[in-house]
């Protein structure tokens, strides 16, 4: 925050330590600071070239003394204008200036391509006050070089808002080609042709490419870089690499290989991670991809038993998660799985097929044609009914589970029964008279209870009623029958 | 030997005047310039400014625009701090500091300071 | 402004001693970094400009280093004619900065 507009609130440059030696009085050369490694560059150019004074940038700021005298144009010295170095060399340039004694307050700074160089470690300023003048040395030095260094460098000058600018030192490192575009890996169709591309840069240019693939030549004439080789077509896998040429010497580039999509080959460790009554849940290890990523998998289902008519079943999946659960399966049953995968070529073979069973599940019917009827001399409810077909018992039958339900003047009682698994007959107490009687019977396995039938209702009179004609299951869609006496 | 020597204490009213005086020797004046620093009673260092002794010309730091003048007489080799309309908190020493090397803004010599006492 | 955080504000310390003195800057201000020292009723001395060099005549017991924003000031082999006041200036950027010292005593 400063008053005078024209005393800018800006850096002024970095003059690191340490100092070898103190300030001495005013006429000594003042903050001589060498390398701060000791190293000595291997090129140094000197700071000025005698006589000429730079032309390009002057500044003649628009200040005078306190006894007006007109002040003489301020300008950089003329200086080395372009240094060609090998990389990884040292180098050190420098600008100069006498700036009268006049600028209490300049800055020096070093620029780059157009930005400041700050905090840059390797600039010193050397400064050598006189009565009228300081004549100032501003140093730059980079131990070793690399392309990253290479550009336009500038000193600048700040005096009361004017810049003087000094001409520019084009450093230009030179070394071997660098490669900025390599070949890279690729998966490739048998007998399609494909392009690789290789581009190197120097300086120095220019960069000529060979091709190499598996050790030997491809090109007898080199290409300039970039260059771009189209491969027709491969029928085994090859090594490719490019060769990158200049004045300084040969690069090569790493080696890429060039593989040729393949079938996959066949998934392995087909494994049953749970069982269900209906399902199985199962994992798989990938096979080789045949350089191809996988699109989806193939997962076959048959069922073990010697009677079965063989048939498959064909589930499809997608690659991930390597995890499908197969449903719709029968309860105790054993069947066999393999797993095959596709990419874009092909269909790999069929795992090794591996033996899987379902567990015991709950039956999946209720019992039919179920009836109940009367027997009033005993005072019981008789029920029949028929076991449900073998297939659908999903299991080993335990027994039977009854509902009967009885309704009167608005009171319900709900009652269980289990019955063993001979028979499909049972009798019930009669609970209560003059009042509807509601039978519902499950199957049970050891899988657990299955559904129950639909309810057979039958009234049960006051005492001394005669024993009537039976209720039974109605025919599918009739309303529940009730026996009505 | 480069010496900066300044005016002795003061005692002034608020309202009033003061010009302080820093007298350089051991050097050629005007190819340095001169800065001025505050040091409030038991307190830190505030840079006040800096005048270019080849023009004359001052530069004010923010807080010292309006009442502060920076001035400098050649001939005498040296430079003066006038602070017009004075208050209470301009009770302080001040210090002159001639400026290090031309494209350099430290300090290479201080003078020894001058007390400016402002009380009623 | 840039600001800048001198500590320790004391220090006590014995003659033949190595002390250590710091100023951090509130932004990066290369190694435009000075130390003074003030003893009382004395002007304050030039010891170290441009982060580490030294003025002249000042003994090499005293050792400037660092550089972006963290400072020091070192004084190795503590001498009775070191006990003073020491503070640091930012010379970056205008407005020129100071740290808020630290009074040196010796035991």
């Known amino acids: 925050a400063i008053t005078e507009a024209r005393e800018e609130a800006k850096p002024y440059p970095l003059f690191p330590g340490p100092f070898p030696g103190s300030l001495q009085t005013d006429h000594t050369p003042l903050l001589s600071l060498p390398h701060a490694s000791g190293y000595q560059p291997a090129l140094m150019f000197s700071p000025t070239q005698p006589g000429r004074p730079h032309t390009g940038n002057v500044a003649i700021p628009q200040v005078t003394s306190v006894e007006s005298k007109p002040l003489p144009p301020l300008a950089f010295k003329h200086t080395v204008g372009h240094i060609i170095l090998s990389e990884h060399k040292g180098v050190k340039f420098n600008c100069s200036i006498s700036v009268p004694n006049i600028y209490q307050d300049t800055t020096i700074s070093w620029w780059k391509d157009g930005k400041e160089l700050l905090g840059a470690h390797h600039a010193i300023t050397q400064f050598y006050p006189d009565d009228e003048v300081t004549a100032i040395i501003a140093s730059f030095s980079i131990t070793s070089v690399q392309r990253s260094d290479n550009g336009s460098y500038i000193c600048k000058m700040k005096i009361n808002n004017e810049e003087i600018v000094s001409d520019p030192i084009y450093i230009e490192v030179q070394g071997l080609p660098h490669f900025t575009k390599q070949p890279e890996s690729m998966n490739v169709t048998r007998n399609t042709a494909f392009n690789l591309t290789c581009q190197a840069v120097g300086p120095p240019e220019p960069v000529n490419i060979f091709w190499v693939q598996n050790s030997s030549r491809v090109n007898e004439q080199p290409e300039k870089s970039p260059s771009v080789l189209t491969v027709p077509g491969l029928t085994e896998m090859a090594v490719f690499s490019c060769e990158a040429h200049n004045d300084k010497g040969l690069t090569v580039s790493k080696g890429v290989q060039i593989n040729i999509k393949a079938i996959p080959s066949p998934p392995t460790e087909v494994s049953i991670r749970n069982s269900t009554a209906h399902s199985i849940l199962i994992s798989w290890v990938p096979g080789f991809d045949g350089y191809s990523p996988f699109r989806n998998c193939s997962i076959q289902v048959k069922e073990a038993d010697p009677l079965s008519n063989g048939s498959v079943m064909i589930f499809n999946t997608s690659a991930l998660p390597h995890l499908y659960q197969i449903k719709q399966l029968q309860a105790l049953a054993n069947y066999s799985i393999g797993v095959s995968c596709m990419n874009e070529i092909g269909w790999s073979a069929v795992s090794p097929w591996i033996l899987a069973s379902t567990t015991e599940g709950a039956p999946s019917v209720a019992p039919l044609n179920v009836t109940v009827f009367l027997n009033e001399s005993s005072d019981n409810v008789d029920i029949r009914w028929m076991k449900p077909p073998t297939k659908q018992q999903d299991g080993e039958l335990v027994g039977y589970r009854i509902s009967h339900v009885w309704q009167s003047a608005g009171i319900s009682k709900e009652l269980l029964e289990e019955v063993g698994q001979n028979g499909s007959r049972a009798r019930i107490s009669v609970q209560v008279h003059n009042a509807t009687c509601t039978v519902r019977i499950a199957a049970v396995t050891r899988g657990g209870v299955g559904p129950f039938s639909d309810p057979v209702k039958i009234f049960i009179p006051a005492h001394g009623w005669v024993d009537y004609a039976p209720s039974s299951t109605p025919a599918p869609g009739n309303a529940d029958p009730v026996l009505i006496i | 030997l480069i010496q900066l020597v300044q005016s002795g204490p003061e005692l002034k009213k608020p309202g009033e005047t003061v010009k302080i005086s820093c007298k350089a020797s051991g050097y050629t004046f005007t190819n340095h310039g001169m800065n001025w620093v505050k040091q409030d009673p038991g307190k830190g260092l505030k840079w006040m400014g800096w005048i270019n002794t080849y023009t004359g010309e001052p530069t004010y730091a923010d807080d010292f625009k309006g009442r502060f003048v920076f001035s400098m007489e050649t001939s005498a080799s040296a430079a003066f701090l006038q602070i017009n309309n004075l208050k209470n908190e301009d009770t302080a020493t001040y210090f002159c500091?001639?400026?290090?090397?031309?494209?350099?803004?430290?300090?290479?010599?201080w003078g020894q300071g001058t007390t400016l006492t402002v009380s009623s | 402004d840039i600001v800048m955080t001198q500590s320790p504000k004391f220090m006590s310390t014995s003659v033949g001693d190595r002390v250590s003195i710091t100023c951090k800057a509130s932004q990066n201000v290369r190694t435009a970094v000075a130390w003074y020292k003030k003893k009382p009723g004395q002007s304050p001395k030039a010891l170290i400009n441009l982060a580490s060099n030294r003025h002249t005549g000042v003994p090499d017991r005293f050792t400037g280093s660092g550089s972006g924003t963290d400072f020091t000031l070192t004084i190795s082999n503590v001498q009775s004619e070191d006990l003073a006041d020491y503070f640091c200036?930012?010379?970056?950027?205008?407005?020129?900065?100071f740290g808020g010292g630290t009074k040196l005593e010796i035991k």
């Open positions: 500091a001639r400026k290090g090397v031309t494209a350099a803004r430290y300090f290479d010599y």
């Open positions: 200036l930012q010379h970056w950027n205008y407005p020129l900065t």
